[in-house]
């Protein structure tokens, strides 16, 4: 029978008695930076080319006995998971292996850097099709390693890495913390985070998605026909490298940003039990398990968006947090979140010729997060329209006044520490969906975009009684671009997008003791692109 992990990543329409997705990733080359491998294992023989690259530290301990099958164990298994003929994800992908980990699975930053440079030079000397680089390793945070990953990613290479097996915040490790890298956590057959002894998969905002990573059957270096079960975020990353190879083989022109958005879009949503993660990491950790798209030709017509969380601002009074989109993505909205509820909102601002999302901490606050909604919107022209605090009691409002521009997101930011605590909420007049409304003490920022065929609509969900969480989702065919709370409720901790749902969080009502300002309204801006839909119909 088909191994559980291959079944898990396969959409139902492919599920027969065997795992045979349409294209095996044959146009893609996957580089594996790991241990040495047993290239004559029948699972990978002829599929993996062992390069002459080797840069590893000496093994620890004077009594270490170098045994070939042990030296090759990790790398052989991962090569099998990516492209093995029997238990591999991308059965058509060809691989090249570089040895950067020794027989004890240890490597150095310098060895990995030189390995990445070797790949870059190989790419320049002999350009081939799409390249995927699998980095199934994790070490302490390294600015220089992250920078090297960024350079390679900007040269058009897709990098996939393990989140790490330390049951810790992946942002503390490299290359997992590099924003340009696709960082993968591990889940088991029950879609739960993988526990490894006393540790387990890493988590947090630096993880892009999870993938099968427990009891993964793959080639064993023990013998030419041997198979073994291994676990960890390396195995999970290998699945995503295989899925990426399949996607790139079907659509070789995909950019890194497009690939990442598709990986997120086609993932299984909200299946992971978040209770496994530390409480402060649950909101930051994506509840996504990787899967193959249901057809080889991706949804080019779809408006793809993802949520990017910033690092925590820290508790100082003027602290800010910044969330950024990838170079090829558009920032369509910006929101903020604070566990204490003490924040001064957020704003979209230009930085280095690109919009970023900045959130502001408030006096006595424990710190804030900025949350960017980053979307793929070809030929987009976006700008931010700002209205300063209003004099009138009706509150501040701003709309998209340029012809053909539509509202994709609303932000509000205020200077005063305690914004309108005892004022009733401002009600937006009906029939004016193309505008943002806020407190009169706040400046309001509207994200306004023009793109061919782009249309957006506002959707609200209000609850009169106090609730810890209010949500509103965009319907099928529409994509959430903006998420905010209607002003007036001081107990709102913030708003953020989870997949296609806008979530507004409020302070635990039992602690506020407030009833007069109980109403909470979540406001979603849902968009779609008719232009992209038409373009895809013409292509078929």
């Amino acid at each position: 029978s088909i191994p559980w992990n291959l079944e898990r990543i396969t959409p139902p329409r492919y599920r027969a008695d065997e795992y045979q997705p349409p294209d095996g990733g044959s146009l893609v080359e996957v580089y594996l930076l790991d241990t040495s491998i047993q290239s004559d294992h029948r699972e990978i023989e002829g599929r993996v080319m062992v390069t002459d690259f080797e840069n590893v530290p000496e093994e620890d301990g004077t009594r270490f006995h170098r045994q070939a099958s042990k030296c090759d164990s990790h790398g052989t298994h991962l090569a099998g998971v990516v492209s093995g003929r029997d238990a591999g994800v991308a059965k058509g992908a060809s691989m090249r292996s570089l040895r950067v980990l020794n027989c004890q699975g240890k490597g150095t930053v310098s060895g990995t850097l030189i390995g990445l440079e070797f790949i870059r030079k190989s790419q320049l000397v002999q350009p081939v099709g799409p390249l995927v680089v699998l980095l199934p390793l994790a070490g302490g945070y390294s600015r220089v390693l992250n920078a090297a990953c960024q350079r390679l990613a900007r040269a058009g290479v897709v990098l996939v890495t393990a989140a790490g097996n330390f049951r810790d915040d992946a942002c503390l490790y490299s290359p997992a913390s590099a924003p340009e890298v696709i960082t993968v956590g591990a889940t088991n057959a029950q879609d739960q985070p993988v526990t490894l002894g006393t540790l387990g998969t890493n988590f947090g905002r630096c993880v892009d998605l999870f993938a099968p990573g427990e009891d993964i059957i793959g080639a064993s270096s023990d013998c030419s026909t041997c198979f073994v079960s291994q676990s960890g975020t390396s195995q999970a990353a290998a699945h995503v490298a295989g899925i990426a190879a399949m996607m790139l083989s079907a659509e070789p022109e995909l950019t890194l940003a497009e690939l990442r958005q598709r990986l997120i879009h086609f993932s299984a949503k909200d299946v992971i039990n978040e209770a496994w993660f530390p409480e402060d990491q649950r909101v930051l950790t994506p509840n996504l398990v990787a899967a193959l798209p249901p057809s080889t030709h991706g949804a080019g017509w779809q408006l793809f968006c993802r949520t990017v969380w910033s690092a925590h601002s820290g508790p100082t009074r003027m602290a800010t947090a910044v969330a950024r989109c990838a170079p090829d993505e558009e920032l369509l909205s910006c929101s903020s979140f604070s566990r204490s509820g003490k924040r001064r909102g957020e704003r979209m601002e230009a930085q280095g010729g690109k919009l970023v999302c900045r959130a502001h901490n408030a006096f006595g606050g424990e710190g804030v997060y900025a949350i960017a909604r980053c979307c793929l919107l070809p030929q987009a022209n976006c700008s931010v329209h700002t209205a300063p605090p209003a004099e009138a009691s009706m509150g501040t409002r701003v709309h998209c006044h340029q012809q053909g521009h539509v509202l994709t997101g609303c932000s509000s930011h205020w200077e005063v520490e305690d914004l309108g605590t005892h004022k009733p909420p401002v009600l937006r007049p009906r029939g004016q969906p193309n505008q943002c409304v806020g407190h009169r003490e706040a400046s309001i920022h509207a994200s306004c975009c023009h793109a061919p065929g782009l249309e957006c609509k506002v959707k609200e969900h209000g609850i009169p009684a106090p609730q810890e969480q209010v949500t509103v989702a965009c319907e099928e065919g529409w994509t959430l671009t903006g998420c905010s709370a209607l002003p007036g409720t001081s107990h709102v901790l913030g708003a953020y997008a989870v997949d296609n749902t806008c979530v507004v969080r409020s302070r635990d009502v039992s602690t506020t003791g407030s009833t007069s300002e109980g109403a909470v309204t979540a406001v979603a801006i849902c968009c779609r692109s008719r232009h992209l839909a038409q373009a895809s119909q013409e292509l078929q």
């Epitope: 004559d40 699972e43 003929r85």
Partner: antibody, heavy 119, light 113 residues
Framework: QVQLVQSGAEVKKPGESLKISCKGS????????ISWVRQMPGKGLEWMGM????????HYSQNFQGQVTISADKSISTAYLQWSSLKASDTAMYYC????????????WGQGTLVTVSS | DIVMTQSPDSLAVSLGERATINCRSS????????????LAWYQQKPGQPPKLLIY???TRESGVPDRFSGSGSGTDFTLTISSLQAEDVAVYYC?????????FGQGTKVEIK
């Protein structure tokens, strides 16, 4: 049911070419390896090589490398063993057998093809 | 190459008696990663293809009578027919399937005494 059906007996002259076949049915042909095994008259079993029909990957025993060619046509679930120039010493019974990554032993065998090479 | 050596070459046993065939590999076929012995036993009757009896050194293939059993580990293995029946007259082969080339023992012919 699962079976491997081989082509019929052949009588050939030295120097002639030959291609014998093994057709799989009752299972997913591309998920299993097909091996060829030789048994010379009154002798034991010798593994010649194998093919993975999914991607036509082959692996030969050193003793048979260059002497025979193993191929497959997955569209008709058939594996082949061929000689470009037969020798009298190729006279033998040839069996095909299948195996799987999770069961890498030969659980199903063809009925055998007897090849006789004689001038 | 892993060399498989069977003993004896032939064996004559009375009906209902125990038949024991030994097989030795030139190197271990037991692998630590999954703790399995990559060894199988086959039965070949005259004019027929071989038939799988035992795999992983001791697991009986479905449909094989329970009088057939396999034992051993590492390099030394045994096939036992606990009570020989007339239909068990055949040549028996051991095979290692861990390394290429896949190799068979030379065979042991079992007859009725």
């Amino acid at each position: 049911q699962v079976q491997l059906v081989q082509s019929g007996a052949e009588v050939k002259k030295p120097g002639e070419s030959l291609k014998i076949s093994c057709k799989g049915s009752g299972y997913s042909f591309t998920d299993y390896y097909i091996s060829w095994v030789r048994q010379m008259p009154g002798k034991g079993l010798e593994w010649m090589g194998m093919i993975y029909p999914g991607d036509s990957y082959t692996h030969y025993s050193q003793n048979f490398q260059g002497q025979v060619t193993i191929s497959a046509d997955k569209s008709i679930s058939t594996a082949y063993l061929q000689w470009s120039s037969l020798k009298a010493s190729d006279t033998a019974m040839y069996y095909c057998a299948r195996d799987h990554w999770s069961r890498p032993f030969f659980d199903v065998w063809g009925q055998g093809t007897l090849v006789t090479v004689s001038s | 190459d892993i060399v498989m050596t069977q003993s004896p070459d032939s064996l004559a046993v009375s009906l209902g008696e125990r038949a024991t065939i030994n097989c030795r590999s030139s190197q271990s076929v037991l692998y630590s990663s999954n703790n399995k012995n990559y060894l199988a036993w086959y039965q070949q009757k005259p004019g027929q293809p071989p038939k799988l009896l035992i795999y992983w050194a001791s697991t009986r293939e479905s449909g094989v009578p329970d009088r057939f059993s396999g034992s051993g580990s590492g390099t030394d293995f045994t096939l036992t027919i606990s009570s020989l029946q007339a239909e068990d007259v055949a040549v028996y082969y051991c095979q290692q399937y861990s390394s290429f080339p896949i190799t068979f023992g030379q065979g042991t012919k079992v007859e009725i005494k």
